[in-house]
């Protein structure tokens, strides 16, 4: 798995809805692949982490003043939806076909 | 200034172009306010950090398995442009009114 020493990348993160207390309203799936963005944003920032100009600037300032300014952070830059079957207020199962922003599609340095 | 103990917020970061070696092509300004996103993304994530569903999920998983999964990260979610006077390839001073993505407008948890 991608630790702090490795560069920013998408890693597996299986989320069980029971673990986060969402099983009270999400019937299915029981778990899903959320992914996680892990690793460092090191100089020089590679194209694959799609850095913004601000992230590039912050990385350069961090190089000069490492105690004063933090590195850019490895975060989701594009998310994907999943479909979920949930219980409404009356306990009736209903489908949300395009439940936005639940899974990481891409990671980057921001 | 916002430390690791405070919640995610926008803080001042004055960037001097000489410090980062960009004074070789940026004529003016000599420095500008880039801002920095600092602070933690703690449970529960407040509305003002505009969390994505994935950030909410990751925060809940981090609560349950703090050593396995990291917290969401405080990053720029909206950037602003600045105007710069720079030297083009032939050394001619050129004004760029909207040099995009140079300054933080908003921070959030991602």
């Amino acid at each position: 798995s991608a630790g702090a020493g490795s560069h920013c990348q998408k890693t597996s993160l299986r989320v069980n809805f029971e673990d986060i207390g969402w099983d009270s309203w999400i019937i299915a799936p029981k778990e899903y692949e959320a992914y996680e963005c892990k690793g460092g944003c090191f100089f020089p920032l590679a194209d694959d982490v799609t850095p913004t100009k601000h992230a590039i600037v912050q990385t350069l300032v961090h190089l000069k003043f490492p105690t004063k300014v933090g590195k850019a952070c490895c975060v989701p830059t594009k998310l994907s939806p999943i479909s979920v079957l949930y219980k409404d207020d009356m306990g009736v199962p209903t489908l949300k076909y395009h439940y936005e922003g639940m899974s990481v599609a891409e990671c980057g340095c921001r | 200034s916002a430390g690791a103990g405070s919640h995610c917020q926008k803080t001042s970061l004055r960037v001097n172009f000489e410090d980062i070696g960009w004074d070789s092509w940026i004529i003016a300004p000599k420095e500008y306010e880039a801002y920095e996103c600092k602070g933690g993304c703690f449970f529960p994530l407040a509305d003002d950090v505009t969390p994505t569903k994935h950030a909410i999920v990751q925060t809940l998983v981090h609560l349950k398995f703090p050593t396995k999964v990291g917290k969401a990260c405080c990053v720029p979610t909206k950037l602003s442009p600045i105007s710069v006077l720079y030297k083009d390839d032939m050394g001619v001073p050129t004004l760029k009114y909207h040099y995009e993505g140079m300054s933080v407008a908003e921070c959030g948890c991602r």
């Epitope: 299915a28 692949e33 994907s80 079957l85 209903t94 949300k96 076909y97 395009h98 | -």
Partner: antibody
Framework: EVQLVESGGGLVQPGGSLRLSCAAS????????MSWVRQAPGKGLEWVGR??????????DYAAPVKGRFTISRDNAKNSLYLQMNSLRAEDTAVYYC?????WGQGTLVTVSS | QSVLTQPPSASGTPGQRVTISCSVT????????VHWYQQLPGTAPKLLFF??YRPSGVSDRFSGSKSGTSASLAISGLRSEDEADYYC???????????FGGGTKLTVLG
Amino acid sequence: EVQLVESGGGLVQPGGSLRLSCAASGFTFSNAWMSWVRQAPGKGLEWVGRIKSKTDSGTTDYAAPVKGRFTISRDNAKNSLYLQMNSLRAEDTAVYYCTTGTYWGQGTLVTVSS
Amino acid sequence: QSVLTQPPSASGTPGQRVTISCSVTNSDIDIFNVHWYQQLPGTAPKLLFFHDYRPSGVSDRFSGSKSGTSASLAISGLRSEDEADYYCAGLDVAMRGPVFGGGTKLTVLG
């Protein structure tokens, strides 16, 4: 008991308009994401579009063949879903179902013919 | 041409086990979100399976599975009342909604 009842189907000329309704009961309609799905005679199922709940921003999405011609709306006070169909074509002829994805109405037939 | 490919027909005799496949031919479709509907002659579709969830009233003779880029629906102990059209459905991320397979007409022989 969950019930979805469509109405408003019928015969319409090409280029014409029609408004379908779906009356919902037995569940919290205002929180549900509602879709229209159609089925041409002897053919398979085709998603038409969907409207999200107000808490999920109430946005609508449409399948490419109907985008710009069909409009989905809802009236949570009346537990009703609507499909406004304009510039109808022969290929829009189908049984139109309103659905939560888990529950479906019996469908209403729309025939586009001159 | 649907991006979810199903065989147009399948058949079996009473008591037999029949499997209907559904394969993904487009990267915008996530196999994770594939689920199944049954449409008896002259009636509206009915949800049979969503992930590992079988709605109440659906026989446990129906089971779903996924592997790689395909999903399948298995019907054991085939009965005459199982004669119907079966549709797989998935989430089309680009279209922001569900997409259906072409359907499989199941005939119970004898």
